[in-house]
């Protein structure tokens, strides 16, 4: 009897949906795998007789529940199917946004770029899928533990009146208030402010 694939899970980030699994121990030889998805009550092959332990389901509709299954095969034998249900719009992980930071005197000017979606138009981003899309920004003085959070209203934000000649670090994530679903933080960007622009009287 052929054992089923183990640890079957969907690794989905920004709607790049990769079904992954692990090959079970099997003494007779190398296993192959077939992965399918349910479409109009019929299972359709997505990856057939593959030696890989993953299958790309990024073409699935973003909405609704999808039933996926995978089994192991050897010669004319096969394992039972292992099923999971996956809802991309709920289950996908929101990857880190892009961020551009520019120093102007004692201010940091930031522009945010929503993560792009795989297999879509070049301009299509996570912001197009989620109506409530917003950003969380956190910043701190480099070398200190205290972090400050703000929620910009737009795709840009300015941190003003910062201490001159001080290095500040900033990171951003996507956030969906209606779902309380937070994305992954971007890597911190650290920049040093310059002089205070205020003119002495």
């Amino acid at each position: 009897m052929v054992p089923p694939p183990e640890n079957v899970r969907m690794n989905s980030v920004n709607f790049k949906n990769i079904l992954q699994w692990e090959s079970p121990a099997f003494a007779k030889g190398n296993l192959t795998f077939t992965a399918q998805y349910l479409s109009y009550r019929i299972f359709q092959d997505k990856c057939m007789n593959t030696t890989l332990t993953e299958c790309d389901f990024s073409s699935l509709s973003k909405y609704g529940d999808h039933t996926l299954r995978v089994r192991a095969e050897f010669a004319d034998e096969h394992s039972d199917w292992v099923n999971i249900t996956f809802c991309p719009v709920d289950d996908t992980i929101i990857g880190p946004p892009g961020m551009q930071v520019e120093v102007l005197a004692d201010s940091l000017h930031m522009r945010f770029l929503a993560p792009k979606i795989e297999n879509e138009y070049e301009t299509w981003t996570m912001k197009n899928v989620y109506n409530s899309w917003t950003y969380n920004v956190q910043y701190w003085k480099n070398g200190t533990d205290e972090k400050f959070q703000i929620t910009p209203q737009y795709d840009f934000e300015v941190l003003r009146n910062l201490e001159p000649w001080t290095t500040y670090c900033v990171q951003v994530r996507g956030f969906l208030p209606d779902r309380n679903k937070a994305g992954e933080w971007s890597e911190p960007v650290c920049e040093q402010t310059t002089h205070d622009e205020t003119v002495p009287s």
């Epitope: 640890n7 999971i84 249900t85 809802c87 709920d90 289950d91 969906l176 309380n180 679903k181």
Partner: nanobody, 123 residues
Framework: QVQLQESGGGSVQTGGSLRLSCAAS??????VGWFRQAPGKAREGVAT????????YYTDSVKGRFTISRDNAKNTVYLQMNSLNAEDTAMYYC??????????????????WGQGTQVTVSS
């Protein structure tokens, strides 16, 4: 900020059942896990569930006995525990937002934690 509150713990005889609940203070469409910690032992993963509830993972010792589920309309995740035995005695915690590795049952991947509910199984 997500706040989690566990309930449903208590004392039960060997072979008995309990249903734990984990209520989020606001809607939380992220992965959720149940973990437990017995006195003098490390915190270990028990079960996790995906945001939509369509995928679940269990540690080997509870497979076939415990069932994790969620009701997103009620912002609540449940752990139904059957055929309990003395080894299940522990403080049970729920945790939310397991990131990319939520299915691995590792405490360090989860961002938000409840205060815990005690489960005691006696013969």
């Amino acid at each position: 900020q997500v706040q989690l509150q566990e309930s449903g713990g208590g004392s039960v005889q060997t072979g008995g059942s309990l249903r734990l609940s984990c209520a989020a203070s606001q809607v939380n469409m992220n992965s959720v896990g149940w973990f437990r910690q017995a006195p003098g032992k490390a915190r270990e993963g028990v079960a996790t569930i995906s945001p939509s509830g369509g995928a679940t993972y269990y540690t080997d010792s509870v497979k076939g006995r415990f069932t994790i589920s969620r009701d997103n309309a009620k912002n609540t995740v449940y752990l139904q525990m059957n055929s309990l035995n003395a080894e299940d005695t522990a403080m049970y915690y729920c945790a939310a937002d397991g990131g990319r590795d939520w299915w691995l049952l590792r405490p360090q991947t989860f961002s938000y934690w409840g205060q815990g509910t005690q489960v005691t199984v006696s013969s």
